[in-house]
Structures are given as C-alpha cells and as structure tokens.
C-alpha cells in the first residue's frame, strides 16, 4: 500500500461508511441479529483531552490492540453466522466487508510506519486495553464504526501530521 494512503481522509471515510451502513441494516433486526454470546470488543469511548495529551506511541498501542481485538471479534461473529441455521441475509455481506476493511486498515497502518503493538516501546508500560462486550451484530458494527471515528481517526490524524513535518 502507498505509505500515506491512510492520510487521505476519503480512505477512512469509505470504511466508516461501510461500518455505519452495516450498523443501520442490523439495527432493525432483533432475533436473527443476536450473537448468542458475549464477544469481547475494545471500549471505544474517548476522553478527548486525555487522548490528545497521550504520547503518540501510547495512542499507537491502543489502536493496534483495539484493531487486533476488533478483528478477532468480527471473525468470531463470522463463525457464529456460519453456524446459524437461519442467518439474516444481508449480514454475510456486511461481515465480509468488515473483515476485508479491518485487514486493509491493518495494512495501511503498517504502510504508514505504525509499528504493531508488540514491537512498540510503550507497549510494556501501557495500561491494559479497556474492553466491553457485544451481544448483537448491531453492537459489533457500532463498536467498529466508533473505533474508526474515534481512536483510529484521531491517531492517524496525529501520525499523518507528524509525517508532514
């Protein structure tokens, strides 16, 4: 991937649009959109000031950990869907898009030069990632879209700005 492709706001916007669309589609269904289990996902709440004051390396740790957990959660959701006797038709398409989106975002972050959490010097001192649980596909997609709108967008904004200097 081109090194700074993720710095083009339209790129993230595309994935965000897909996530919002998936959330809206699943908002209407109840029974068939239950995960039938609690899947651990990153807590996407942001205290804006605290986030902005965080070292960029620390932000990177949170983003990588969140991305890894979110990817796991979406793959788990796909497995639940595969085992479902009567899956809600549009779900499969949106799950596939989410998996593809998360893979692309991971690739784009690597291209930007954002080291993965395990190799970051701040990883050892980082507070454990705050998590919540999702019990519906709607909640899963909402966490995905909030993660993109929040921590990921704020982090890439800062990382791209630093790259401009």
């Amino acid at each position: 991937a081109p090194p700074r492709l993720i710095c083009d706001s339209r790129v993230l916007e595309r994935y965000l649009l897909e996530a919002k669309e998936a959330e809206n589609v699943t908002m209407g269904c109840s029974e068939s959109c239950s995960l039938n289990e609690n899947i651990t996902v990153p807590d996407t709440k942001v205290n804006f000031y605290a986030w902005k004051r965080m070292e960029v390396g620390q932000q990177a740790v949170e983003v990588w950990q969140g991305l890894a957990l979110l990817s796991e959660a979406v793959l788990r959701g796909q497995a639940v869907l595969a085992n479902s006797s009567q899956p809600f038709e549009p779900l499969q398409l949106h799950m596939d898009k989410a998996i593809s989106g998360l893979r692309s975002i991971t690739t784009l972050l690597r291209a930007l030069g954002a080291q993965e959490a395990i190799s970051l010097p701040d990883a050892a001192s980082a507070a454990p990632l705050r998590t919540i649980t999702a019990d519906t596909f709607c909640k899963l997609f909402r966490v995905y879209s909030n993660f993109l709108r929040g921590k990921l967008k704020l982090y890439t904004g800062e990382a791209c700005r630093r790259g401009d200097r």
Partner: antibody
C-alpha cells in the same frame, strides 16, 4: 491552588470590538487547555471553543465559528476571547475554564458583557 | 451537531434520592460529564468519565451512562444540593456539548 482570574465586566455598544481575558495561576498553563463557555441571562451553558496554549491548537463550536476569536499568550499565562463587532445578542456571562482529563475542572469567576445602544 | 436533552426540572424531598437524566443519540458510546451550578456562581464539575468523582465531591453523587441515557444520581439529598445541573459530553471530533440544564428543587 489553581486559579483562573477573568477581566472585569464590560458595557459596550453594538458594533464595538472587545477582548476579555483569563489569567491562569497555580498550575502549568501550557499543560492544560482553556475552554470558553457562554451563559446568556437565565439560560444554560454553551461551549464556545477551546485552545491548547502549548500547541496553539484551537477548536470552535460550530455555533461560534466566525463569531469570536480565541487566543492565548503563554508567556503571561493568559487566554483571550474577542469580538470584532458586538451585537446585542452577545450580552451574556462568559466563563473561562481549565480543560484537563476532568474537563472544565476549574472555572474563572466569569465576565459579564452587556451590549446595549 | 450533537444534542443533549435534559428535563427542565426535578423535585425531591430532603433525604430522598434524586435522579437527573440526560439523553442523546447513542450517548452511551461517549463519556458523560455533570456540572452543578448554584445561583450567581460558576459551575462545578461533579462527575467525569461517566461515573468518576473529582476530589472534594461527596460520595452521594454518582453517575451512570448506557444506551441513549446518562443519569446523575444524588442520594440522601440535602437542601444545599438545590442547583442547576448540566450534563455534557465530548464528541469524537473534539467538540464539547452541554445539555440544556435541569433545575433541582429540594422540597420543604
């Protein structure tokens, strides 16, 4: 002790300009942001914007963008809120507050601005 | 732009529990903050990050936030708690939004 001391009350005519101030003491001024909040007579709180004095980053509320200017002089630990052309509807109490992880955790005493012909 | 809605007024008898609500679209996805403002005074932060209390704020004040609603709970209400209460939140973009405020009246 953290203190934010605001400039005194102002009475102005429509069309006049104005700059009010907020001086921070008892803490590292550049380690926190300053936010500005408007409270019209008998009404609620409205966030106007914030400034990071260290990075000179400013964010305005969409409602106040283009209506006011927020600035800061870190050498004298002071933040400012200014108008180039006041309107009667700008009559209000204006508060500055320190923004930290506990947002708006310390407030100034407020500056009452009255705009009347 | 993001909107937070509060009831204009809440009344409670001394010693009872007051609950003040604040609603906004998926507010539970954001942190909620609460301020107390007494007449003629500047506001005071009483709850931050949904449920944390700044130092000096009594344990009687607590907060919760899920779904579309954040709630400020004041237990064992005292006459001195009579004030206007405002909720607020950070948006992901860095805007700080206040609710319209709720006047808490302590009866008697």
């Amino acid at each position: 002790e953290v203190q934010l001391v605001q400039s005194g009350a102002e009475v102005k005519k429509p069309g006049e300009s104005l700059k009010i101030s907020c001086k921070g003491s008892g803490y590292s001024f550049t380690s926190y942001w300053i936010g500005w909040v408007r409270q019209m007579p008998g009404k609620g709180l409205e966030w106007m914007g914030w400034i990071d004095p260290y990075r000179s980053e400013i964010r305005y509320s969409p409602s106040f963008q283009g209506q006011v200017t927020i600035s800061a002089d870190k050498s004298i630990s002071t933040a400012y809120l200014q108008w180039s052309s006041l309107k009667a509807s700008d009559t209000a109490m204006y508060y500055c507050a320190r923004v930290s992880s506990e947002p708006f955790d310390s407030w100034g005493q407020g500056t009452l601005v009255t705009v009347s012909s | 732009s993001y909107v937070l809605t509060q009831p204009p007024s809440v009344s409670v008898a001394p010693g009872k529990t007051a609950r003040i609500t604040c609603s906004g679209d998926k507010l539970g996805d954001h942190y909620a903050y609460w301020y107390q403002q007494k007449p003629g005074q500047a506001p005071v932060l009483v709850i931050y990050d949904d449920s944390k209390r700044p130092s000096g704020i009594p344990e009687r004040f607590s907060g919760s936030n899920s779904g579309n609603t954040a709630t400020l709970t004041i237990s064992r209400v005292e006459a001195g708690d009579e004030a206007d209460y405002y909720c607020a939140t950070w948006t992901f973009e860095g805007d700080y939004v206040f609710g319209g405020g709720t006047k808490l009246t302590v009866l008697g």
